[in-house]
């Protein structure tokens, strides 16, 4: 079965820094979402080879991509405290397949010592019933809620 390998599990970064999240699959994708989890899940990007990526307005101008949809590294720049949260990759194949999630902790520089990642993957605090066409459920964890998206159709 198709899987999504996602790394890192957790990262602690100061305000203004950057973070890399990598989503790797064995191929055969139509595209991949990076989603910030929470009571109101929030798409950050949708990436499909050969198509201009869709990026949420909150991250426009501070997202870079490298690689292809099968092995994609997403770099989020100039992180803000409100970017703290759990981000998961959703690969679109004939079913939905989810990564294990990346917990991003954005901290004030002086409080770096207070917030550290453990080695464990991020904990999903509440799991909804998985969509029937999904390889894994879409975990929900509390996070800062972003502004509503302003992404629209791609040609």
């Amino acid at each position: 079965a198709q899987e999504v390998q996602q790394s890192p599990h957790c990262t602690t970064v100061p305000v203004g820094a950057s973070v890399n999240i990598t989503c790797s699959t064995s191929g055969g994708l139509r595209g991949i979402y990076l989603r910030q989890l929470g009571p109101q899940p929030q798409d950050i990007i949708y990436y499909e080879d050969g198509v201009v990526p869709t990026t949420d307005r909150r991250f426009r101008g501070r997202i870079d991509f490298s690689g292809s949809q099968d092995n994609l590294t997403i770099t989020m720049h100039r992180l803000q405290l409100s970017d703290t949260g759990t981000y998961t990759c959703q690969a679109i194949t004939e079913v939905n397949v989810y990564g294990s999630g990346t917990l991003v902790l954005v901290t004030e520089e002086q409080s770096q010592g207070w917030h550290r990642c453990s080695d464990a993957p991020p904990r999903a605090s509440a799991l909804p019933a998985p969509p029937t066409g999904s390889a894994l459920p879409d975990p929900q964890t509390a996070s800062a809620l972003p502004d509503p998206p302003a992404a629209s159709a791609l040609p």
Epitope: Q40, P41, E94, D138
Partner: antibody, heavy 116, light 107 residues
């Protein structure tokens, strides 16, 4: 059992506006993408709009800039705001659960929109 | 946009018959093809997704096949409740597009 119930259809003049609603039950609404599909009087099916579970929206060129899809995860409701309506928008409008980016596995019974 | 064509707009068959409905795409769609059934009352149901996967609750007399640009839906043993219009739909690329439908009637 998953149920989708559309409402808000009616008769509207060209250039007018209408807002359709789709109430969902029996599913974890926030975990699913949702779509609107319409059926013309000639019985052709046309995809109208989609919204991913994370809020990205997608439209065909025929409605882009005139229609807006949105969702209220707290109330389990999907919306379609239609403006600058044209006679060619006359159709039965269905909402559907979008299981995997275009695979529409549950449909509502539809609501009729007439632009005349 | 990808155009979906169902060349047969209506089809008449007898109960118990094996019926095949065809659908072709204007370019390859990598098996991202669904089949829907619309009953005379307007109710729409998904029958087959990803070319050949039977949706839950759909009788096993329905099957799908195909690849590239050419796809088909087969009903192996026609029953009265199968009277409906059948639509194919591609979901390989936006915008999602549907065939014109094939109306199935009983002889």
């Amino acid at each position: 059992e998953v149920q989708l119930v559309e409402s808000g259809g009616g008769l509207v003049k060209p250039g007018g506006s209408l807002k359709l609603s789709c109430a969902a039950s029996g599913l974890t609404f926030s975990s699913y993408a949702m779509s609107w599909v319409r059926q013309t009087p000639e019985k052709r099916l046309e995809w109208v709009a989609s919204i991913s579970s994370g809020g990205f929206t997608y439209y065909p060129d025929s409605v882009k800039g005139r229609f807006t899809i949105s969702r209220d995860n707290a109330r389990n409701i999907l919306y379609l705001q239609m403006s600058s309506l044209r006679s060619e928008d006359t159709a039965m409008y269905y909402c559907a659960r979008d299981e995997v980016r275009g695979y529409l596995d549950v449909w509502g019974a539809g609501t009729t929109v007439t632009v005349s | 946009d990808i155009q979906m064509t169902q060349t047969t707009s209506s089809l008449s068959a007898s109960l118990g018959d094996r019926v095949t409905i065809s659908c072709s795409a204007s370019q390859g769609i990598s098996n991202y093809l669904n089949w829907y059934q619309q009953k005379p009352d307007g109710t729409v149901k998904l029958l087959i997704y990803y070319t050949s996967s039977l949706h839950s609750g759909v009788p096993s007399r329905f099957s799908g096949s195909g690849s590239g640009t050419d796809y088909s839906l087969t009903i192996s043993n026609l029953e009265p409740e199968d009277i409906a219009t059948y639509y194919c739909q591609q979901y390989s690329k936006l915008p999602y597009t549907f065939g014109g439908g094939t109306k199935l009637e009983i002889k």
